[in-house]
Interface confidence: low
């Protein structure tokens, strides 16, 4: 039979510049001598020779003189390879090939890693900052491997994913320098943290910057939004209302208005330096420019999609600033259910039938209720599934298994919990023939 060669399944992780041991072992039979052993280490993909032992002696390294065996341990079945001064270019799979009378081989992966430096943070602009200003924060970390994962968060630990641009460049040794840029609208003050993670070492390098903009002595701007979520039908336009009270002598040149996604801080729309800067949100947003001077900072969101659902922050800065968040709840009505019956002919009392109620393209997920002709709820033997399509709209299929009586009507009600809209379907079974109600 084949010789059993064992290597670790998990990659061997080695830091750049250190030595790594690629473990490989076999079980020598009684009476085994090294003269019988043929041991070859090679690169799995290219079959390039790395190191070999043959004819009773170590044939040496064929890999930049940076490999060695453990000669004193070979007789006990230890065929491990020592790789010195590990480089990024060493990363990959190595095959340990052992031949005595029979042969066997196994591949072990080398994962190279290098820790990232503590990030340095820079701010642009870095003086005369006021609430409502847009600043660019750059986080830089050096000489790591493999490519880093970069995370930004605010002082409360909330992730900031909008308006982040991250670039990673490898140097001649293959080590990466990472630069991540966050564009953010300043609040009253704020801490912004950058975390650079080495995904292999699970090593996190942190830095943060706290920005305290200059404030004027006047009170904060009172920004008002509706407390209840704004409900909008998919495909229609929605208005996210936001208002502030302009002081006497107020002019639009003084106004900084920013709409952004509350969670990610992604910019949606802005008005600065006396003019509308336009939509940063798929060109589906607009302000009400004629009403801005009266304090109406509302946002029009066109052709609403399921993906728009969530919280939007209206941020107003004049001399001082204020902000408030409004929730958008997206909805779509469910279609009138279609009813199918299986089996659908030669039905007799006592037969078990499967009634399927299907309703399409609603949002959010529906509540489904079944009842008999007397309005009594039917809860046993009901299976309901809801599947979202690419637009995020749900198709609902509810299946009722029931034992037929002499005759009966079975009704299905599909309710949209946001719109409180009910869509009904029913089927009446009267032995033979069976009748369906006409479509409404």
């Amino acid at each position: 039979g084949a010789l059993e060669v064992q290597v670790p399944e998990d990659p061997v992780v080695a830091l750049v510049g250190t030595d790594a041991t690629l473990c490989c072992s076999f079980s020598p039979e009684p009476g085994f001598s090294l003269a019988q052993l043929n041991l070859i280490w090679q690169l799995t993909d290219t079959k390039q020779l790395v190191h070999s032992f043959a004819e009773g002696q170590d044939q040496g390294s064929a890999y930049a003189n940076r490999t060695a065996l453990f000669p004193d341990l070979l007789a006990q079945g230890n065929a491990s390879l020592r790789l010195q001064r590990v480089r990024v270019a060493d990363e990959g799979s190595f095959t340990c090939f052992v031949s005595i009378r029979d042969f066997g081989s196994a591949a072990v992966s080398l994962q190279v890693a290098a820790p990232y430096s503590k990030p340095s943070m820079t701010l642009e602009p870095n003086k005369d900052l006021r609430p409502g200003d847009t600043v660019t924060i750059t986080c830089s970390s050096y000489q790591g491997y493999p490519e880093a994962e970069v995370f930004w968060q605010d002082g409360q630990g909330v992730p900031l994913t909008g308006n982040v641009t991250t670039s990673q460049m490898a140097n001649e040794q293959g080590l990466f320098d990472v630069h991540s840029i966050l564009r953010v609208v300043l609040g009253a003050n704020g801490t912004y943290s950058c975390l650079v993670r080495n995904p292999v070492l699970q090593q996190d390098a942190h830095s943060s910057v706290t920005i305290t903009p200059q404030r004027s002595p006047t009170g904060a701007v009172e920004v008002q939004v509706p407390e209840d979520p704004v409900v909008a039908l998919v495909g229609t336009d929605a208005t996210l209302r936001c208002s502030f009270s302009p002081e006497p002598g107020f002019s639009l040149a003084q106004l900084n208005l920013i709409w952004q996604l509350t969670d990610t801080k992604q910019l949606v729309h802005s008005f600065t330096e006396g003019r509308d800067q336009g939509s940063a949100y798929a060109n589906r947003t607009a302000l009400f420019p004629d009403l801005l001077a009266q304090g109406n900072a509302s946002l029009r969101l066109q052709r609403v999609r399921v993906a728009d659902e969530g919280s939007f922050t209206c941020f107003v800065s004049i001399r001082d600033f204020g902000s408030a968040a409004v929730s958008l709840q997206v909805a779509a009505p469910y279609s009138k259910p279609s009813m199918t019956l299986e089996p659908n002919k030669d039905l007799r009392p006592g037969d078990t039938v499967t009634i399927t109620c299907s309703s399409y393209r609603g949002y959010p997920e529906a509540e489904v209720f079944w009842q008999d002709g007397q309005g009594v709820p039917l809860t046993g033997n009901v299976t309901t599934s809801q599947m979202a399509n690419e637009q995020g709209l749900f198709d609902v299929h509810s299946v009722l298994r029931v034992v037929l009586g002499a005759n009966g009507t079975y009704s299905c009600l599909v309710r949209n919990p946001v719109l409180q809209q009910d869509a009904h379907g029913s089927v009446t079974i009267t032995g033979q023939p069976m009748t369906f109600p006409p479509e409404a």
Partner: antibody, heavy 116, light 110 residues
Framework: EVQLLESGGGLVQPGGSLRLSCAAS????????MSWVRQAPGKGLEWVSG????????YYADSVKGRFTISRDNSKNTLYLQMNSLRAEDTAVYYC?????????WGQGTLVTVSS | QSVLTQPPSASGTPGQRVTISCTGS????????VTWYQQLPGTAPKLLIY???HRPSGVPDRFSGSKSGTSASLAISGLRSEDEADYYC???????????FGGGTKLTVL
């Protein structure tokens, strides 16, 4: 011969804690990733957590994140699962398995029952 | 609901060939190798197929695995009564950063 022996299961009240152990033998424990997999009564398999050979990298299912902690002591050839804030839905047989990506050996499991 | 989809049941008569499917997505089966496990009644699961189609020593060659795109299949030929068990597919999901199993398929030998 590879052997994995789980222990530490039992009856615990909701909100309580348990620590499961898995004693490994028959292979070089420190060279292999390890995992915990559970199976609720009459249900399918659910991966719970995995850990790299050295113990530095750990992964968790969303359902246990923040409540369960996987660890290992390579000097004792033992894998652990610390389970806090236990819920009724954590009731299951917990298996320890060798490797992280293909579970080539499994223990016989230890039953954890969370009930008041 | 499982990330990987398997039929809940399958059946066949002795000597027949049965196939069990496992459907996933690009983040799991599409980018990682699939493993199959067999769980006989009242016992711990056992590795049956790894790396899509490889059999560990001791597993009969009646069991075979294959993969195409985001789906995998386990085929059992020459069905025997001792094959009656639950079969699970599994793989790593890169999006979830987690190992995922199929819901399991109960194989009945009629």
């Amino acid at each position: 011969e590879v052997q994995l022996l789980e222990s530490g299961g039992g009856l615990v009240q909701p909100g309580g804690s348990l620590r499961l152990s898995c004693a490994a033998s028959g292979f070089t424990f420190s060279s292999y990733g390890m995992s915990w997999v559970r199976q609720a009564p009459g249900k399918g398999l659910e991966w719970v957590s995995g850990i790299y050979s050295g113990g530095s990298s750990k992964y968790y299912a969303d359902s246990v994140k923040g409540r369960f902690t996987i660890s290992r002591d390579n000097s004792k050839n033992t894998l652990y699962l610390q389970m806090n804030s236990l819920r009724a839905e954590d009731t299951a047989v917990y298996y320890c398995a060798k490797n992280r990506l293909r579970f080539d050996y499994w223990g016989q499991g230890t039953l954890v029952t969370v009930s008041s | 609901q499982s990330v990987l989809t398997q039929p809940p049941s399958a059946s066949g008569t002795p000597g027949q060939r049965v196939t069990i499917s496992c459907t996933g997505s690009s983040s799991n089966i599409g980018s990682n190798s699939v493993t199959w496990y067999q769980q006989l009644p009242g016992t711990a699961p056992k590795l049956l197929i790894y790396s899509d189609s490889h059999r560990p020593s001791g597993v009969p060659d009646r069991f075979s695995g294959s993969k195409s795109g985001t789906s995998a299949s386990l085929a059992i030929s020459g069905l025997r009564s001792e094959d009656e068990a639950d079969y699970y597919c599994g793989t790593w999901d890169a999006s979830l950063n987690a190992y995922v199993f199929g819901g399991g398929t109960k194989l009945t030998v009629l």
